[in-house]
Interface confidence: medium
């Protein structure tokens, strides 16, 4: 067959769908793949095919748009179920081609069953809320392209399996969920159940999404290095094996990268001749406070390594810190021998 | 430019089969469906069926499903439909139509094949 | 099945006046998926429009279609002597496609 460039099986895009509700699944060539839209290509004479492969199948396969009740139907570079069926799970490709040019890329399609209470294999997006925070809303999402304007949806709204009515602080809002102000116990799966008409049918699109109650960026502080401190002095004799945690307190801060590192006489442990390794470790608040610990272990410490400066560094969109370990030789314990001549010579 | 160059007229007593031939000259033919619509004398358009050759994977109108068989040749660019158990009221004109692409209109015809049945 | 049901069966009129012909659905036809079809005695049938609105390739802008759901309408403003043919609607968006009985539009 001709020959066709071949963006393979784009497994980024895993798309799951709920069974028996509608889907719109964009073509992923002009969002990722290609530098022009749709429309471009369209009206360079270029067209649009779509074809699948059935699950457990190798075999590829029109997709039949005759389909009673135009069950299945393109529209531009959107491919429209009305609505799924489980045997639609499969490996979808759209390919856009004339007699000169051809690219096609495949992503995989998952239709997905949920039971009475919304539980499913559904991968579910986290939306994160600040704790007494004030009034805060999450959208109920990707349902924009389903309906015109001029349809007005039915909207409701699920905490888990309840109706979210009478609730304390959450308040259905339409198309929004609003916390009055965000709290520990409102940790938990939202659903919002989206009903619409379309000629003469009613469809229900149903959206879960996670909402993680997090630290309030007016309570965020700066990196807090726990230790090293000044009260800790890190005593060794040559031969012994030296460990030295770096344990840091990172307030929660949206899209915040935090870091830590250890530099020895100024460089990156990398960057010095010494046997030197570092191990991790992040635990969480339950508002998604973060501490790191890293612990700096040199196995037989020399003399010189005890003379060295352990600095332990921190970063987060807060600030930068720093803390150096006290670090030095034990010095050896006097010899009998020599406290008695020390003492008659006193004498 | 693209054109479907149809098969002659055919002449076929009831009971038999007929297979009529569209070529595809001048254009990418495996990518686009392939469907065939018949006219009665005076009558109107019926459709049925249509094959999008780079798959090979036909569907058909259930009152000719059975009936109807239809097949590309993808190195001679050329759909078949073949008829079978022909009655009286299968004399029509038979039209293969370009598809513009799996489920757009039928932007280009082949010329028609007259099919008369006859005993 | 969507059943095409087209009005009137003959139009009788003079060149230069417009034509309205009508295509009434059975069922919605979801996705816009309508089209219109001139055919001359002894020819076969040639796209006129297609997506209920688009004019296919060179066709002229004295064709034009409309409405959604289940009403459609082919509008001819200005008819010419090579106008008066029959006109199919045709929905082909749900198995199995079906076309309607047709408009004769015939010179008064």
């Known amino acids: 067959s001709e020959r066709c460039d071949d963006w393979g099986l784009d497994t980024m895009r895993q798309i799951q769908v709920f069974e028996d509700e509608p889907a719109r699944i964009k073509c992923p060539l002009f969002e990722h793949f290609l530098k022009f839209n749709y429309s471009t290509a369209h009206s360079a004479g270029l067209t649009l095919i779509w074809y699948w492969t059935r699950q457990d199948r190798d075999l590829e396969e029109p997709i039949n748009f005759r389909l009673p009740e135009n069950r299945i139907s393109k529209e531009k570079d959107v491919l429209w179920f009305r609505p799924t069926l489980l045997n639609d799970t499969g490996n979808y490709t759209c390919m856009l081609r004339n007699t000169t040019y051809c690219s096609k890329v495949a992503f995989p399609l998952e239709v997905v069953q949920k039971d009475s209470c919304f539980n499913s294999p559904m991968k579910l997006p986290v939306h994160k809320l600040y704790i007494e925070y004030g009034i805060q809303r999450i959208t109920c999402p990707n349902v924009d392209g389903y309906f015109p304007s001029s349809v007005k949806p039915t909207i409701t709204w699920y905490m888990g399996c309840y109706k979210i009515q009478n609730f304390n602080n959450v308040i259905p809002e339409g198309m929004n969920l609003s916390f009055l102000i965000a709290l520990i116990s409102n940790n938990g799966n939202y659903t919002c159940v989206v009903t619409y008409p379309e000629n003469g049918r009613t469809f229900h699109l149903t959206r879960t999404l996670t909402v993680k109650v997090v630290g309030s960026p007016k309570n965020a502080v700066p990196p807090v290095i726990h230790s090293p401190n000044d009260h800790v002095v890190y005593e060794k004799e040559p031969g012994e094996e030296l460990l030295i945690p770096c344990t840091v307190y990172f307030s929660f801060l949206m899209d915040s990268r935090n870091e830590v590192w250890w530099t020895i006489d100024g460089k990156k442990p990398d960057d010095i001749t010494i046997d030197v390794t570092i191990n991790e470790s992040i635990s969480h608040s339950r508002t998604e406070d973060e501490t790191r610990t890293q612990i700096l272990s040199i196995k037989k410490v020399t003399s010189e390594d005890l003379k060295r400066s352990y600095v332990c560094h921190a970063r987060s969109a807060k600030g930068e810190v720093a803390k150096a370990a006290k670090v030095k030789q034990k010095v050896p314990a006097p010899r009998y021998t020599v406290e008695l001549a020390c003492g008659f010579g006193a004498t | 430019q693209v054109q479907l160059l149809q098969s002659g007229a055919e002449v076929k007593k009831p009971g038999s089969s007929v297979k009529v031939s569209c070529k595809a000259s001048?254009?990418?033919?495996?990518?686009?469906?392939i469907d065939w619509v018949r006219q009665a004398p005076g009558q109107g358009l019926e459709w049925m069926g249509g094959?999008?050759?780079?798959?090979?994977?036909?569907n058909s109108a259930q009152k000719f499903q059975g009936r109807v068989t239809i097949t590309a040749d993808k190195s001679t660019s050329t759909a078949y439909m073949e008829l079978s158990s022909l009655r009286s009221e299968d004399t029509a004109v038979y039209y293969c139509?370009?598809?513009?692409?799996?489920?757009?209109?039928?932007?280009?015809w082949g010329q028609g094949t007259m099919v008369t049945v006859s005993s | 099945e969507i059943v095409l049901t087209q009005s009137p069966g003959t139009l009788s009129l003079s060149p230069g006046e417009r034509a309205t012909l009508s295509c009434r659905a059975s069922?919605?036809?979801?996705?816009?998926?309508l089209a219109w079809f001139q055919q001359r005695p002894g020819q076969a049938p040639r796209l006129l429009i297609h997506?209920?609105?688009r004019r296919a390739t060179g066709i002229p802008d004295r064709f034009s279609g409309s409405g959604s759901g289940t009403d459609f309408t082919l509008t001819i403003s200005r008819l010419e002597p090579e106008d008066f043919a029959v006109y199919y609607c045709?929905?082909?968006?749900?198995?199995?496609?079906?076309f309607g009985g047709g408009t004769k539009v015939e010179i008064k």
């Open positions: 997506g209920v609105s």
């Open positions: 139509a370009r598809n513009g692409a799996t489920s757009d209109a039928f932007d280009m």
């Open positions: 094959i999008i050759p780079i798959f090979g994977t036909a």
């Open positions: 045709q929905q082909y968006g749900s198995s199995p496609l079906t």
């Open positions: 069922l919605s036809v979801s996705s816009n998926y």
């Open positions: 001048g254009g990418t033919f495996s990518i686009y469906a």
